[in-house]
């Protein structure tokens, strides 16, 4: 029951996390710029991974996609890649985890297969979450280091620089959404990995002598054997592994010089 709950909760948490990663990737407000010392034109500028926007005090808003890849910083391309990889891995992880859920029966799928699928999806969620956190952190680092503060082309007739509108770059809402979503996906992945341990069937393998005490004859076969105790999970002498030994039902006794005293 606890395993099912852990697995189910891990799936839901990861689902929310991946939805958040997708939302963050699509959002426009990765960085915001307050043009705070321009009393004439009160405009608010914000940028996403795919386009940049301007909002005026009148409420007018315009967004345009980036014209060219060449004018974009390499770091932005890296962030795009990380977020997309995170989404793809997360989506595959969700697909795998649906079939791995203990509460869903698909054909005659064994618990061991479900355990493997749960572990796979858990690892995918962890990597997906890490990709999202890394992508958002790289972008945040770009903002902190003021990567693009000196990009304006400003010239005067005297050949000197003219100082333009001061811009203050701040973290946009998408960064916080991305961090939280990445964290949730990571936590969901860890929960799936924990659930995997509970799903794996517990089998005890022994190396011992296979014997039965029917009369005076004893079948003895050297090599790897398992013990049949007559109780527990192996009452039907089911073969656990083949180490050159056979179960009692399979053993044939042939007359030998030791049979007769």
């Amino acid at each position: 029951m606890a395993v099912t709950a852990c697995q189910g909760l891990g799936f839901v948490v990861s689902l929310i996390g991946i939805a958040g990663i997708i939302a963050a990737t699509c959002m426009d407000q990765w960085s915001t710029q307050d043009l705070y010392n321009n009393p004439v034109t009160a405009v608010f500028n914000y940028q996403g991974l795919w386009r940049s926007c301007v909002r005026e005090s009148s409420g007018f808003t315009e967004c345009r996609g980036y014209f060219t890849l060449l004018g974009l910083p390499a770091m932005l391309q890296a962030v795009r890649a990380l977020m997309i990889v995170g989404i793809v891995l997360g989506a595959i992880g969700l697909l795998v985890s649906i079939f791995a859920l203990k509460c869903i029966r698909i054909g005659s799928m064994e618990d061991s297969a479900k355990a493997n699928m749960t572990l796979t999806s858990g690892i995918m969620f962890i990597v997906s979450g890490l990709c999202a956190i890394a992508g958002v952190s790289v972008f945040a680092n770009m903002l902190v280091t003021n990567f693009w503060m000196s990009t304006a082309n400003m010239y005067t007739g005297m050949g000197g620089m003219v100082q333009t509108v001061q811009t203050r770059y701040t973290f946009g809402a998408a960064l916080f959404v991305g961090w939280v979503a990445g964290g949730l996906t990571l936590i969901g992945g860890v929960m799936m990995c924990i659930a995997c341990r509970g799903l794996a069937p517990e089998e005890t393998n022994y190396k011992a002598v296979s014997y039965h005490a029917s009369g005076h004859s004893v079948a003895y076969k050297p090599g790897g054997f398992k013990a049949s105790t007559g109780f527990g999970s192996n009452t039907k002498n089911k073969k656990i592994y083949d180490g050159g030994a056979r179960t009692e039902d399979e053993v044939q006794s042939y007359p030998s010089k030791h049979d007769y005293v």
Partner: nanobody, 120 residues
Framework: QVQLVESGGGLVQPGGSLRLSCAAS????????MAWVRQAPGKGLEWVSG???????NYADSVKGRFTISRDNSKNTLYLQMNSLRAEDTAVYYC??????????????WGQGTLVTVSS
């Protein structure tokens, strides 16, 4: 290659009028923000008037009611009509285009400036 070329400056008496023009090439005159900025001798930059893509028009308090900003999209030209000029309006007037959308790096383009002298 982006170019902003101002014209229309000159010597004018107090109370007179002038019309400054800013012909743009390589940049859309209906950019996110088009503005006139001036620099009086020995002083810093002062925003005069601004016109946004959305049509918002703003003026500095010192020029309200006397200056009018406008643009002609067909000619790709920005204008500043200056009436009732005063001695304190003497400055080099710069045309400024600021682009935020469609570019990751906000762009700010400036003209070479045109001198306006108000003197009797």
């Amino acid at each position: 290659q982006v170019q902003l070329v101002e014209s229309g400056g000159g010597l004018v008496q107090p109370g007179g009028s002038l019309r400054l023009s800013c012909a743009a090439s390589g940049v859309d005159i209906s950019s996110d923000v088009m503005a006139w900025v001036r620099q009086a001798p020995g002083k810093g930059l002062e925003w005069v008037s601004g016109l946004t893509r959305g049509g918002s028009i703003n003026y500095a308090d010192s020029v309200k009611g006397r200056f009018t900003i406008s643009r002609d999209n067909s000619k790709n030209t920005l204008y500043l009509q200056m009436n009732s000029l005063r001695a304190e309006d003497t400055a080099v007037y710069y045309c400024n285009a600021e682009i935020y959308t469609g570019t990751f790096y906000p762009r700010s383009y400036w003209g070479q400036g045109t001198l306006v002298t108000v003197s009797s």
